[in-house]
Interface confidence: low
């Protein structure tokens, strides 16, 4: 029998799969590649023409507890003279990630996967100008 | 969600740490948000540091499709529409969590995996190294 996966590709289920109650899935939260490090260019959030700041959000009932969000510093972009040019726009770049949410119901606890939208930085774009008739 | 009974003294025995293995509901909260960056915005084309998007597909992972950005130029696009090599287009990278099927091919057994993705590009002033 073929078992559908999240996302409609079909797999032949191996015999070695662990038994899982209906409507749920087994999740090992020991992270693969836990010690991987981001190797981004240095201080790009300050050197960008669309600079941004970082804020750390903390939630003990979320795994991982710490999620870092970026916020663009300006509406416009920084020009060669170091001044804000409002003819251009600083806009956020976003990426989805998964987190595990722990929910308490009385003396019981449940776990739910959740998609979270993270703002990772900003980029400078030419604005879309809408002409009104 | 799937509820797990807590021990009899549950009001006083709050566990601050997540267990190593959890049973989670198959329904993912916020699952239907738009995951295709080409459809969600055209920043990749309008940016002064434009990028192309590469579809990375892996059926052993959820989400199975992830979009990777690659900057189109070394420099940035100036007001005249030309590439200015006095500035640099650089990728903005982010660590995200995905689900990896473990054991492989199992429909309902996963492990969290951290992967590094390039989400887009931004235009930066280069770091100039002066050689003595």
């Amino acid at each position: 029998r073929k078992i559908p996966k999240v996302g409609h590709t079909f797999f032949q289920k191996p015999e070695s799969c662990p038994p899982v109650p209906g409507g749920s899935m087994k999740l090992d939260i020991g992270i693969i590649n836990e010690n991987q490090r981001v190797s981004m260019s240095r201080n790009i959030e300050s050197r960008s023409t669309s600079p941004w700041n970082y804020t750390v959000t903390w939630d003990p009932n979320r795994y991982p507890s710490e999620v870092v969000q970026a916020q663009c510093r300006n509406l416009g972009c920084i020009n060669a003279q170091g001044k804000e040019d409002i003819s251009m726009n600083s806009v956020p770049i976003q990426q989805e990630t998964l987190v595990v949410r722990r929910k308490h119901q009385g003396c019981s606890v449940s776990f739910q996967l959740e998609k979270v939208l993270v703002t990772v930085g900003c980029t400078c774009v030419t604005p879309v100008i809408h002409h009104v008739q | 969600g799937i509820t797990i009974p807590r021990n009899p003294g549950c009001p006083n025995s709050e566990d601050k740490n997540f267990p190593r293995t959890v049973m989670v509901n198959l329904n993912i909260h916020n699952r239907n948000t738009n995951t295709n960056p080409k459809r969600s915005s055209d920043y990749y084309n309008r940016s002064t540091s434009p990028w192309n998007l590469h579809r990375n597909e892996d059926p052993e992972r959820y989400p199975s499709v992830i979009w990777e950005a690659k900057c189109r130029h070394l420099g940035c696009i100036n007001a005249d529409g030309n590439v200015d090599y006095h500035m640099n287009s650089v990728p903005i990278q982010q660590e995200i969590l995905v689900l990896r099927r473990e054991p492989p091919h199992c429909p309902n057994s996963f492990r969290l995996e951290k992967i590094l993705v390039s989400v887009g590009c931004t235009c930066v002033t280069p770091i100039v190294h002066h050689v003595a």
């Epitope: - | 192309n52 998007l53 690659k70």
Partner: nanobody, 122 residues
């Protein structure tokens, strides 16, 4: 399998113009592109257009001089080449690919035409 047939190549003087055509038949694709190979050099990306025709991509060396387009049926792709230079001399290939990502990577193109020679010389 997609069949591709290019036409429109020839000899032109520097500063002149040419229009290349590529007729496609067979299964659908995500993008069509023009790539070129000059004598003794590697094949390089010139321009690409998405299957919908909404997205176009150009190599920096041709931006502003070349324009890629498709007819309404989507079966024919064009490359309008203006302000031609001697360094544009090459065999121009039409190709298709899946995905719009890394369009400049010639290794990602799956189906290739036989090529049409463009010579820019006075």
């Amino acid at each position: 399998e997609v069949q591709l047939v290019e036409s429109g190549g020839g000899l032109v003087q520097p500063g002149g113009s040419l229009r290349l055509s590529c007729a496609a038949s067979g299964r659908t694709y995500d993008a069509m592109g023009w790539l070129r190979q000059a004598p003794g050099k590697e094949r390089e990306f010139v321009a690409a257009i998405s299957g919908s025709g909404d997205d176009t991509y150009y190599a920096d060396s041709v931006k502003g001089r070349f324009t890629i387009s498709k007819d309404n049926s989507g079966n024919t792709m064009y490359l309008q080449m203006n302000s031609l230079r001697p360094e544009d001399t090459a065999v121009y290939y039409c190709a298709t690919r899946r995905g719009l990502y890394y369009v400049w990577d010639s290794n990602d193109y799956e189906n290739w035409g036989q090529g049409t020679l463009v010579t820019v010389s006075s």
